[in-house]
């Protein structure tokens, strides 16, 4: 029962973290105008990754795309692409999980195919938990040393009657969505990884024959030394007269007519 | 037709309070910020006040900060200047204004003329 | 706060003249989010409210004749009328629409030769 809540928690913290990725990577307020010298500016200025956008007092919000590809900073092309990596890998990981999933049964998979596929789903939803991470501190990383460089202009140059003021822009919203979002991802593939550990079907049993010796009440089981010696992986307090060895939480039924893929 | 009518101007004693009303018809009035605007006798324009459309983001000028308080009533369609402890330099013609596209005013009212006399 | 300072205060002209005022800002008015500069162009005739001529420091009002042209960046801008009508004579304003409070220019009167 841990296995399945485990894989199905971690199912649904990965969801959510992706759902979080691909709403921070589209957002538009990645970095905000800084309001710290001016508090009551008429002109707000905000960027995404995608387009950069401008809100009046007046209400009216005009956005412009980023139509040049080449013309952009190597770092935001960077951070798209780590953004990008980390929804492919998340989405394919979703999908694949999906299908890993204890409590949905597809033909007669074995547990081996499940736990395999929820290791590989657990390494995706790191990879892609990490992606995000790295864009989104890339991004914020970019943010804090233009912050540092425009606001040294700000200080130099100003012996001029006039003020020429330069836009600061601080942390917009979506890198702390993407912040978030990526440490959820990651717990979530975290959380596959550790169901994967519980998903992996010990070692074959065979049907085990009891033999009663003398003085010794020691059950035989084929199949080596590690069958009844307590060494190896099967210490769990088991049946061994059922076959299909398993605890309660690894039992597997056939599908039925009444099951859906 | 966009049409903006103040009212409620008049005379009023220093030290005494007014209400100025501005109806606005031909627009929704809730997605619009709006301004009151004065002109003193012979003199240029000067901004008042702004709210925005529901009312989370509003300014004043220094000049009338603490006295001045605009508010708005968007299911009347109507915008509002309570005046209190009034001046004889708030004499001047009051104008309500729609603000537009680049912060600009784009439709004024006729105008409500305040003095403020003993 | 910005100063905004409007020049000359009065032209006299006659119609079909070329004329330009000024209107010159203590701070930059560009922004360089949308590349637009926050400076709007009004003409108040006698008895009236000011009309919205300029937005954008270049952008025409819809409705207003093309011999009103906006131009100048950053603190410097300038309204120009290629030939001046007689139904154009009035006081001018520039505004500044990039930070509150939002400051009037003290006008430019055109008057008739």
């Known amino acids: 029962m841990a296995v399945t809540a485990c894989q199905g928690l971690g199912f649904v913290v990965s969801l959510i973290g992706i759902a979080g990725i691909i709403a921070a990577t589209c957002m538009d307020q990645w970095s905000t105008q800084d309001l710290y010298n001016n508090p009551v500016t008429a002109v707000f200025n905000y960027q995404g990754l995608w387009r950069s956008c401008v809100r009046e007092s007046s209400g009216f919000t005009e956005c412009r795309g980023y139509f040049t590809l080449l013309g952009l900073p190597a770092m935001l092309q960077a951070v798209r692409a780590l953004m990008i990596v980390g929804i492919v890998l998340g989405a394919i990981g979703l999908l694949v999980s999906i299908f890993a999933l204890k409590c949905i049964r597809i033909g007669s998979m074995e547990d081996s195919a499940k736990a395999n596929m929820t290791l590989t789903s657990g390494i995706m939803f790191i990879v892609s938990g990490l992606c995000a991470i790295a864009g989104v501190s890339v991004f914020a990383n970019m943010l804090v040393t233009n912050f540092w460089m425009s606001t040294a202009n700000m200080y130099t140059g100003m012996g001029g009657m006039v003020q020429t003021v330069q836009t600061r822009y601080t942390f917009g919203a979506a890198l702390f969505v993407g912040w978030v979002a990526g440490g959820l991802t990651l717990i979530g593939g975290v959380m596959m990884c550790i169901a994967c550990r519980g998903l992996a079907p010990e070692e074959t049993n065979y049907k085990a024959v009891s033999y009663h010796a003398s003085g010794h009440s020691v059950a035989y089981k084929p199949g080596g030394f590690k069958a009844s010696t307590g060494f190896g992986s099967n210490t769990k307090n088991k049946k061994i007269y059922d076959g299909g060895a398993r605890t309660e939480d690894e039992v597997q039924s056939y599908p039925s007519k009444h099951d859906y893929v | 037709d966009v049409q903006l009518v103040e009212s409620g101007g008049g005379l009023v004693q220093p030290g005494g309070s007014r209400k100025l009303s501005c109806a606005a018809s031909g627009f929704t009035f809730s997605t619009f910020g709006m301004h009151w605007v004065r002109q003193a006798p012979e003199k240029g324009l000067e901004w008042v006040a702004f709210i925005n459309g529901d009312s989370s983001s509003i300014y004043y000028a220094d000049t009338v900060k603490g006295r001045f308080t605009i508010s708005r009533d968007n299911p009347k369609n109507i915008l509002f200047l309570q005046m209190t402890s009034l001046r004889s330099e708030d004499t001047a013609m009051y104008y309500c204004a729609r603000f537009a596209r680049g912060n600009s005013f784009d439709y004024w009212g006729q105008g409500t003329t305040l003095t403020v006399s003993s | 706060d910005i100063v905004m300072t409007q020049s000359p205060s009065s032209l006299t002209v006659t119609a079909g003249e070329k004329v330009t005022m000024s209107c010159k800002s203590s701070?930059?008015?560009?922004?360089?989010?949308?590349?637009?500069?926050?400076l709007t162009w009004y003409q108040q005739k006698p008895w009236q409210p000011p009309k919205l001529l300029i937005y954008w420091a270049s952008t025409r009002e819809s409705g207003v004749p093309d011999r009103f042209t906006g131009s100048g960046s950053g603190t410097d801008f300038t309204l120009t009328i290629t030939s001046v009508q007689t139904e154009d004579l009035a006081v001018y304003y520039c505004?500044?629409?990039?930070?509150?409070?939002?400051?009037f220019g003290a006008g430019t009167k055109l008057e008739l030769k």
């Open positions: 505004q500044i629409g990039y930070t509150y409070p939002l400051t």
């Open positions: 701070q930059s008015l560009f922004n360089s989010g949308n590349q637009k500069n926050y």
